[in-house]
């Protein structure tokens, strides 16, 4: 009998309000055994897949999707879905990315802390640190 697949979660680092030109990384999380994670933009018609999956915690796997330099056109709704053979999961909740002008003035608000649609606590990396530092990553042009 096929197992019921839990819904994935989605979060954004460093947050969901990103200054123009800054970077953002979407983090999709699902159960152990995920083969492919997909980040969808607004609807299913535009998406980006990765099979580069890491072990996030004893019960979770994750994948990361990075936009190096955020543009106004990157603002919108994002969600995750995953493939765990032999089937696809339901979609996560939507996460909204907001892009703000980076005025750089003393009164400009800080970027919001990492927020997520789904579990709010980031699972700890395993002791061998599968995660890479967030630099020089995916441009994801074909999402947009």
């Amino acid at each position: 009998q096929e197992e019921d697949l839990p819904r994935p979660s989605i979060s954004a680092e460093p947050g969901t309000v990103i200054p123009l030109g800054s970077h953002v990384t979407f983090v999709c999380r699902g159960p152990v055994g995920v083969q492919t994670f997909r980040l969808e933009r607004d609807s299913r018609s535009t998406y980006n897949d990765t099979e580069d999956v890491s072990q996030a915690s004893p019960s979770e796997s994750e994948a990361r999707f990075r936009i190096d330099s955020v543009r106004e056109g990157n603002a919108g709704l994002y969600r995750c879905i995953y493939y765990k053979p032999p089937k696809w999961s339901e979609q996560s909740d939507y996460l909204e990315l907001l892009v703000k002008e980076s005025s750089g003035g003393p009164d400009s608000p800080d970027t919001e802390p990492g927020s997520s649609a789904g579990p709010t606590q980031r699972p700890s990396d395993n002791s061998h640190n599968e995660h890479a530092p967030a630099s020089q990553g995916l441009k994801a042009e074909h999402l947009y």
Epitope: V32, Q55, P133, G137
Partner: antibody, heavy 119, light 107 residues
């Protein structure tokens, strides 16, 4: 059909260098983590190196036995994986396999290329 | 590093026999375990991932079980084409490590 074709193996003297290549086809190379795994003659399997995809910043990982001597890299525009091997030792003699993987297991293997380190 | 202890190192069985291979990790690997089959002169073939998930195209006589540190690979009814060396491998953390292998022969 997934295809991984290694090249660049051969005979090299201890202390020498060699660069292995792996031409990949039949799948979306740039979204996959890639690996090198080796097997000494008559022995078991040993993981050598891993390189993640661009979305994970091309992060690299190495076995202790090759750290500081071997460098894994990739050229997504050419669908090619590389292993630069320097300061080679006799114990590096093995068949080297290029492997496509996802989360750390090895789903698709090339046919292997033999590296012999001998004087 | 996580050590993977695989046993037996070799075994001889008859066609139709049930064959069991075990793999013990030096620490919990949270079912991040794969099993491979390697025939002489060939590259290994992935049979099972996540301890129990059979890869597409792999015959159902192969199965995996286990959790924590202890894992088992079973061939329910040995066939002549199953003669090979079998390896377990953990992928919970780097460095990824393999068991020493089990050489399976026909009696």
């Amino acid at each position: 059909e997934v295809q991984l074709v290694e090249s660049g193996g051969g005979l090299v003297q201890p202390g020498g260098s060699l660069k292995l290549s792996c031409a990949a086809s039949g799948f979306t190379f740039n979204t996959n983590a890639m690996y090198w795994v080796r097997q000494a003659p008559g022995k078991g399997l040993e993981w050598v190196a891993r390189i993640r995809s661009k979305s994970s910043n091309y992060a690299t990982y190495y076995a202790d036995s090759v750290k500081g001597r071997f460098t894994i890299s990739r050229d997504d525009s050419k669908n090619t994986l590389y292993l630069q091997m320097n300061s080679l030792k006799t114990e590096d003699t093995a068949v080297y396999y290029c492997v496509r993987g996802g989360s750390g297991f090895f789903a698709y293997w090339g046919q292997g290329t033999l590296v012999t380190v001998s004087s | 590093d996580i050590q993977m202890t695989q046993s037996p190192s070799s075994l001889s069985a008859s066609v139709g026999d049930r064959v069991t291979i075990t793999c013990k990790a030096s620490e919990d690997i949270y079912i991040r375990l794969a099993w491979y089959q390697q025939k002489p002169g060939k590259a290994p073939r992935l049979l099972i991932s996540t301890a129990t998930s059979l890869e597409t195209g792999v015959p159902s006589r192969f199965s995996g079980s286990g959790s924590g540190t202890d894992y088992t690979f079973t061939i329910s009814s040995l066939q002549p084409e199953d003669i090979a060396t079998y390896y377990c491998q953990q992928y919970w953390s780097t460095p990824y490590t393999f068991g020493g292998g089990t050489r399976l022969e026909i009696k």
